[in-house]
């Protein structure tokens, strides 16, 4: 503790100019005071002034008023500082002395004589209020007041609490009268060193370094840090925890970039064709007769399906076609014959079989020939076997499909992905996206094509368990464990009997 006992001398009266021994001062009593402050004693005794002592210069002769003086010699009130907890009780001895010597340092003069003394014993609480008193004896009267106040930065009823206001990173506070801390606006905590974050800032996912701020921890975003950041590259998905990619309805894949309901969302098939959610592009169009192309967008000639039989020639009309039949045939498609086997109707070595008691016939054609009279060489391209706009070409007994760029396979049914060029360096895994390939990098690499070597590899310590694959570069300053079937957890450490979920972030 630390405080000051203050004594204000106000007036001293010694009208007859007498000393305590009954002698008079010549020419008058040149008066100074000695003050001794000590612990409480029921009976005041001589001995050390345990709480302090002080002397004044000569303040006047015989009777005088003592003026307040804040500096230099003759300071009034007198100050008796102490460096301990104020006990609340005290003993005070005030002695008035006459000196024949030096005004300023009468203590040192020989021949000093006592005029009078008073003793005060009692209790005194710390406070700013002055306690005023007056003491008389037969010859003198002394008016005075006194109090105990705490030194700067000390507080409480015994001046025992040290408190220094501050406004730095070890505290932002002022001091209450009892020495407790009163936090400045925006700060809290025992030492007022914890900022009060923006109202509503998420307790776990956000923090602040100054008041009314909300800084998000990795994986979180938004003004209040209450929105998770989904997996990097997540297209049609959301998250409930950071780096998750839970697909919206109708979407699938690690990045929710595969449209599981392309037919409904985009209606790609034209001219009444049927759309099914399958195939390399996520859909397949099945065309109505008379249409072709990937989206059945190409209308065929009405004669394209070769409707005229028995060598009839087909002629396109506005919404239909007309068959010109060869001799011996009639009907809309020249399907009826007036010929019999006797007319040798079967060409190219076909054998004739009589039907309906010889009134009609049927030809059995040798290989590579077709038609009711074996008049047509087999065209293996008529069934439009080439998908995705591929061109069909007859090659003797077989046929081949010439595919458009970006497709392959015997029927051009396979989509050549952007990943076929192996754009991912250092063993990165390639994912086809609409806007080009995306690489998921192995441990130790990052960048769009896994071309950047990471110096501090979060996967180097092998954080993923149970054979899980570790990826970096998917989340800031972090790694992702892609769990095998039957395991979950941020490090794939928990076995479950559930189907595999999305990767957990560590």
């Amino acid at each position: 503790g630390s405080g000051i006992f203050q004594l204000r001398l106000q007036e001293f009266v010694n009208q007859r100019g007498m000393l305590a021994n009954g002698q008079s001062c010549e020419p008058g009593c040149r008066t100074f005071f000695r003050i001794c402050l000590k612990h409480f004693q029921a009976t005041f005794s001589e001995g050390p002034c345990t709480f302090g002592n002080v002397s004044t210069p000569v303040l006047g002769t015989n009777s005088f008023v003592v003026r307040d003086k804040n500096s230099g010699s003759g300071r009034n009130p007198l100050q008796l500082p102490f460096n301990f907890t104020w006990p609340g009780t005290f003993s005070l001895n005030i002695q008035a002395w006459h000196t024949p010597g030096d005004d300023l340092r009468p203590e040192t003069s020989p021949g000093n004589s006592l005029i009078s003394q008073i003793i005060i014993q009692g209790s005194l609480a710390v406070g700013k209020i002055w306690r005023t008193d007056e003491q008389n004896d037969t010859l003198t009267r002394l008016s005075y007041s006194y109090r105990v106040i705490c030194s700067d930065n000390y507080y409480g009823e015994s001046c025992s609490r040290l408190c220094k206001k501050r406004d730095d990173h070890f505290g932002h506070y002022e001091c209450q009268p009892d020495g407790s801390l009163s936090c400045l606006p925006g700060w809290t905590g025992k030492y007022c060193d914890q900022p009060i974050c923006l109202s509503g800032c998420h307790e776990q996912n956000g923090y602040c370094s100054k008041p009314d701020e909300c800084i998000c921890r990795p994986g979180w975003q938004g003004r209040l840090c209450n929105e998770c950041i989904p997996h990097n590259g997540c297209r049609h998905g959301t998250c409930s925890i950071p780096w998750q990619c839970a697909c919206d309805e109708g979407w699938g894949g690690l990045f929710c970039d595969q449209d599981l309901n392309y037919c409904t969302h985009h209606s790609p098939c034209k001219n009444g064709s049927t759309c099914s959610n399958s195939g390399p592009k996520g859909y397949t169009c099945t065309c109505l007769p008379g249409y072709t192309g990937e989206h059945c967008e190409l209308g065929l000639s009405k004669c394209a399906s070769n409707p005229c039989r028995n060598g009839g020639s087909c002629k396109d009309q506005e919404n239909s076609y007309h068959c010109l039949c060869p001799p011996g045939y009639y009907g809309q498609h020249c399907e009826h014959s007036t010929l019999t086997c006797a007319d040798s109707p079967c060409f190219n070595g076909g054998s004739c079989r009589e039907r309906n008691q010889g009134s009609s016939y049927a030809c059995e054609c040798p290989p590579n020939f077709t038609g009711s009279n074996c008049e047509k060489k087999v065209d293996r391209c008529t069934s439009n076997p080439c998908a995705n706009g591929g061109q069909c070409q007859n090659r003797g007994p077989s046929r081949t499909c010439r595919c458009r760029p970006g497709f392959t396979g015997t029927h051009c049914e396979l989509h050549i992905s952007d990943c076929a060029r192996s754009p991912c360096a250092h063993g990165g895994t390639c994912h086809d996206l609409e806007n080009g390939p995306v690489c998921t990098c192995p441990a130790g690499f990052s960048g769009r094509r896994c071309e950047v070597r990471i110096t501090h590899d979060a996967c180097a310590s092998g954080p993923c368990f149970n054979g899980a694959t570790c990826y970096t570069g998917l989340s800031p300053n972090n790694f992702v464990c892609n769990c095998p079937y039957g395991f979950v957890g941020s490090r794939c450490e928990f076995p479950v009997g559930l189907p595999p979920s999305f990767p957990w972030v560590a």
Partner: antibody, heavy 121, light 107 residues
Framework: EVQLVQSGTEVKKPGESLKISCKVS??????????WGWIRQMPGKGLEWIGD???????YYNPSLKSQVTISVDTSFNTFFLQWSSLKASDTAMYYC?????????????WGQGTMVTVSS | EYVLTQSPATLSVSPGERATLSCSGQ??????ASWYQQKPGQSPRLVIY???KRPSDIPARFSGSNSGDEATLTISSLQSEDFAVYYC?????????FGQGTRLEIK
């Protein structure tokens, strides 16, 4: 018992970069009661406060040194760092890390053993 | 820039005697002062914090005070292990400030 263990002696050339570390053991760097400081002592000279960092990443620097150094923290490794992008000969000094305690009104009760950095061409 | 000035730069005292080290700075009494002891080849060690408090491992012969413009470290009866360099330290807003040190040597 809290211990601050610093990385080893470094000898560098002017213009080179450097990052020294201070690993905290026996306690968490993420406690709200502490800041983690760096103090330097040039050969034959007194102590000079460089700056400190809170576990959240908030930093405070000596205004006379601010632009020359960077203090960072990695809570997952319970470690904090002092780094230079371009060293000068005048950076030659012993560098101490210390724990500054809010409860001790900013007094540093635990110190690292020191990292001697020598910068010379 | 806040400055702490320690005096004397070197203090020669005999073992068993009292040593008083001073640290002055503008209105230093309104700040909390700490004192550190450093021996050759060793890291500094906290001996006084919050003006006058001692860490549990520091002997009672070390005491401190701080008022006005001056903080004082007093070692009541010097032991051989007390001879070292002593630094005072205070915080000026968000910046730590050390004095230049006082070397306490055997007389």
């Amino acid at each position: 018992e809290v211990q601050l263990v610093q990385s080893g002696t470094e000898v560098k050339k002017p213009g080179e970069s450097l990052k020294i570390s201070c690993k905290v053991s026996g306690g968490s760097i993420s406690s709200s009661s502490y800041y983690w400081g760096w103090i330097r002592q040039m050969p034959g000279k007194g102590l000079e406060w460089i700056g400190d960092i809170y576990y959240t990443g908030s930093t405070y620097y000596n205004p006379s040194l601010k632009s020359q150094v960077t203090i960072s923290v990695d809570t997952s490794f319970n470690t904090f760092f002092l780094q230079w992008s371009s060293l000068k000969a005048s950076d030659t000094a012993m560098y101490y890390c210390a724990r500054e305690d809010v409860i001790l009104r900013g007094g540093s009760d635990y110190w690292g053993q020191g990292t001697m950095v020598t910068v010379s061409s | 820039e806040y400055v702490l000035t320690q005096s004397p730069a070197t203090l020669s005292v005999s073992p068993g005697e009292r040593a008083t080290l001073s640290c002055s700075g503008q209105r230093l009494g309104d700040k909390y002062a700490s004192w550190y002891q450093q021996k050759p080849g060793q890291s500094p060690r906290l001996v006084i914090y919050e003006d006058s408090k001692r860490p549990s491992d520091i002997p009672a012969r070390f005491s401190g005070s701080n008022s006005g413009d001056e903080a004082t470290l007093t070692i009541s009866s010097l032991q051989s292990e007390d001879f070292a360099v002593y630094y005072c330290q205070a915080w000026d807003r968000d910046t730590g400030v050390f004095g230049q040190g006082t070397r306490l040597e055997i007389k």
